[in-house]
């Protein structure tokens, strides 16, 4: 391959190593968890739950505390820090895609349901635009099957 491509790869690699993508992971997982709490895709069997009032079993308690509720504007804080990190990839679409792939890879074993995984991918694809950045045109967020439970 051309010399400049190799240099570009190396530059992207060092950018990825320098970047702290944790705020992005936190922001996205928070969104998914908030939606779980509010819209309740998790059926909870009323017959098993002596505490549960007679209610739609697919409904979850929207007032259940989230680990972030007590941290004030935790979510927007994470998003802001996430956007600052992604901004570093603004001029390299392929590298932006690799950053998104890394986020997906890091969180894939946290997402054990089809809906959760699909929503995470959807939110992840929208992340650059939410940050006012250009989104990569083609970016494959599929994760290879893992042999063991990563953490």
């Amino acid at each position: 391959r051309q010399q400049w491509e190799l240099q570009g790869d190396r530059r992207c690699q060092s950018q990825l190593e320098r970047a702290n993508l944790r705020p992005c992971e936190q922001h996205l997982m928070q969104k998914i968890q908030r939606d779980e709490d509010s819209y309740g895709r998790d059926p909870y069997s009323p017959s098993q739950d002596p505490y549960s009032p007679s209610q739609d079993p697919d409904r979850r308690d929207p007032y259940s505390p989230s680990p972030y509720d007590r941290r004030g504007a935790g979510s927007s804080q994470h998003q802001e820090r996430c956007c600052n990190e992604l901004n570093e990839f603004e001029n390299n679409q392929r590298c932006m895609c690799e950053a998104l792939q890394q986020i997906m890879e890091n969180q894939s074993d946290r997402l054990q349901g089809r809906q959760q995984e699909q929503q995470f991918k959807r939110e992840l694809r929208n992340l650059p635009q939410q940050c006012g950045l250009r989104a990569p045109q083609r970016c494959d967020l599929e994760v290879e099957s893992g042999g063991r439970d990563r953490y």
């Epitope: 944790r22 998790d42 079993p57 054990q112 953490y151």
Partner: antibody, heavy 117, light 111 residues
């Protein structure tokens, strides 16, 4: 919304048994599923997990190579094939639904497996 | 493997009084996504277990607000502000960070 286990019974050491779990009231194919067991008078032990798309399967060390978890999404059924059974496998086996975010939000009533000569 | 240790293993309680159960993990359960992968389950006599708390502090649907979970990293606590007779049973903590592992269980009964 329920999980109903079946297939338990008495089996001799070294024997085999296949447990089934019929799911209803939710979209089975969208969720990871687990098997958790409880020996008589003892605590809970996680046994096996299968992802919604079967991409990943995980097992506790003590059953690796002997137990196989599988699922048939068209029948909304989870299976646990247990081979080379040992006395220490005697337990109530629960079928459990993963919330999608790794916590367990629906449990079956359990089926008793007794390994004894 | 992550080892979960609960204390006490037996807890006699008086209805109306508070109670708390401790759970310690052999390594931190705080993931890079900011969540603690620690859940609490209650198994009432003759019943299947049921979810009480997930992600360390989130109360499951239908669980009364007298139950709360706290802690981060390796040390977690389940609190019951005022114990009721229906709260008796065995309480288990479970880590879901790396595979899944339960604590030994804490038997709560009325004094």
């Amino acid at each position: 919304v329920q999980l109903v286990e079946s297939g338990g019974g008495v089996v001799q050491p070294g024997g085999s048994l296949r447990l089934s779990c019929a799911a209803s009231g939710f979209t089975f194919r969208d969720y990871g599923m687990h098997w958790v067991r409880q020996a008589p008078g003892k605590g809970l032990e996680w046994v096996a997990f299968i992802r919604y798309d079967e991409r990943n399967k995980y097992y506790v060390d003590s059953v690796k190579g002997r137990f196989t978890v599988s699922r048939d999404n068209s029948k909304s059924t989870l299976y646990l094939q247990m081979n080379s059974l040992r006395a220490e496998d005697t337990a109530v086996y629960y079928c459990v639904k993963d919330s999608g975010l790794r916590y367990f939000n629906l449990w079956g009533r359990g089926t008793l497996v007794t390994v004894s000569s | 493997d992550i080892v979960m240790t609960q204390s006490p293993l037996s807890l006699p309680v008086t209805p109306g009084e508070p109670a708390s159960i401790s759970c310690r993990s052999s390594q931190s359960l705080l993931h890079s996504n900011g969540y603690n992968y620690l859940d609490w389950y209650l198994q009432k006599p003759g019943q299947s277990p049921q979810l009480l708390i997930y992600f360390g502090s989130n109360r499951a649907s239908g669980v009364p607000d007298r139950f709360s979970g706290s802690g981060s990293g390796t040390d977690f606590t389940l609190n019951i502000t005022r114990v009721e007779a229906e709260d008796v049973g065995v309480y288990y903590c479970m880590q879901a960070l790396q595979s899944w592992t339960f604590g030994q269980g804490t038997k709560v009964d009325i004094k």
